[in-house]
């Protein structure tokens, strides 16, 4: 059975837009009016992954591009990258546990905590125009509140 | 407070059509998914469709493609079914519910239901 | 079509009475399955997600289950409970639902 997937954006808690930055990369800034095209469009699944009270497992893939945000270990440290997947196999219900993020909703503030390193989050720094990053502390200086906006299929 | 709440009853002439509205209040109407289930008398529980106001994203049960339209007013809070070419056997109580956009909550709210009856 | 089969289809109990009615789902469905139940007016939900208790719902409630196997459980039957209950599986189109089981009063 195909996975459920929805079309979303995510702004950050100080509303900076997620845009492309080079072909396998995310950052974070301000955008206005017609830039506000500019920002990507995730099509988030809903997949399966371990039981949790608050936490629901889902993937972010980049709408219509076969690319994925993924969770990895580089020189011995999480970090978020875009992955790029075959498309005939993507999104399934079973994803690898790298492209699983638990998504954590309160007051419809999200965090998205990486399933493969748990308490590392998808992260922003405070700074305009920095990658997106997978951060291992939250309530500090890095921001992992994002909000969340429906967009057409 | 939190409710979801349907139009009147209805009898309708076979070959027509009928359309009942599903008013929501007290809830963030765009983030949950608006579920179209019937139960005919004596009989189980069929879902028709579902749609999510904030995206516009609709998914239909086949059985019923092309008989049944829903539709979302965000202006209103209000959601609606449509079904066409209707039979006798479309007599049913048509309810609506809500599901979180995320599915997690499964149906967490009922509306009070809405009896069409099909009958020449 | 995932079929969604439910047992027993009704029961007799007293108030104060354990009761536990299971569903059986052709696949499996992960942890999208709730519990609901029917009076005359509108359905009430009881269990999401197999096991979480809606707010409001007695904690006499309870659900449990993985996979194809799902049970709702009534620890302490009290008069309210008489009614109907259904399952219903949301993981794949079309949504399905159990049969029902009705409870009534011994």
């Known amino acids: 059975a195909p996975v459920r997937s929805l079309n979303c954006t995510l702004r950050d808690s100080q509303q900076k837009s997620l845009v492309m930055s080079g072909p396998y990369e995310l950052k974070a800034l301000h955008l206005q009016g017609q830039d506000m095209e500019q920002q990507v469009v995730f099509s988030m699944s809903f997949v399966q992954g371990e039981e949790s009270n608050d936490k629901i497992p889902v993937a972010l893939g980049l709408k219509e591009k076969n690319l994925y945000l993924s969770c990895v270990l580089k020189d011995d440290k999480p970090t978020l990258q875009l992955e790029s997947v075959d498309p005939k196999n993507y999104p399934k219900k079973k994803m690898e546990k790298r492209f699983v993020f638990n998504k954590i909703e309160i007051n419809n503030k999200l965090e998205f905590e990486s399933a493969q390193f748990p308490n590392w989050y998808i992260s922003t720094s405070q700074a305009e125009n920095m990658p997106v990053f997978l951060g291992g502390t939250k309530g500090g200086q890095d921001i992992t509140d994002f909000t969340m906006q429906f967009v057409s299929s | 407070q939190v409710q979801l709440v349907q139009s009147g009853a209805e009898v309708k002439k076979p070959g027509s059509s009928v359309k009942v509205s599903c008013k929501a209040s007290?809830?963030?109407?765009?983030?949950?998914?608006i579920e179209w289930v019937r139960q005919a008398p004596g009989q189980g529980l069929e879902w028709m469709g579902e749609i999510l106001p904030g995206s516009g994203d609709i998914n239909y049960n086949e059985k019923f493609k092309g008989r049944v339209t829903i539709t979302a007013d965000k202006s209103t809070s209000t959601a609606y079914m449509e079904l066409s070419s209707l039979r006798s056997e479309d007599t049913a109580v048509y309810y609506c519910?809500?599901?979180?956009?995320?599915?997690?909550?499964?149906?967490?709210?009922w509306g009070q239901g809405t009896l069409v009856t099909v009958s020449s | 079509d995932i079929q969604m089969t439910q047992s027993p289809s009704s029961l007799s109990a007293s108030v104060g009475d354990r009761v536990t009615i299971t569903c059986k789902a052709s696949q499996d469905i992960d942890r999208f399955l709730s519990w609901f139940q029917q009076k005359p007016k509108a359905p009430k939900s009881l269990i999401y997600r197999?096991?979480r208790l809606v707010d409001g719902v007695p904690s006499r409630f309870s659900g449990s289950g993985s996979g194809t196997d799902f049970t709702l459980t009534i620890s302490s039957l009290q008069p309210e409970d008489f009614a109907t209950y259904y399952c219903?599986?949301?993981?794949?189109?079309?949504?399905?639902f159990g049969g029902g089981t009705k409870v009534e009063i011994k």
């Open positions: 007290g809830y963030t109407f765009d983030r949950y998914w």
């Open positions: 219903v599986q949301y993981d794949e189109f079309p949504y399905t």
């Open positions: 197999v096991k």
């Open positions: 519910a809500r599901m979180y956009y995320d599915y997690d909550q499964g149906f967490s709210l």
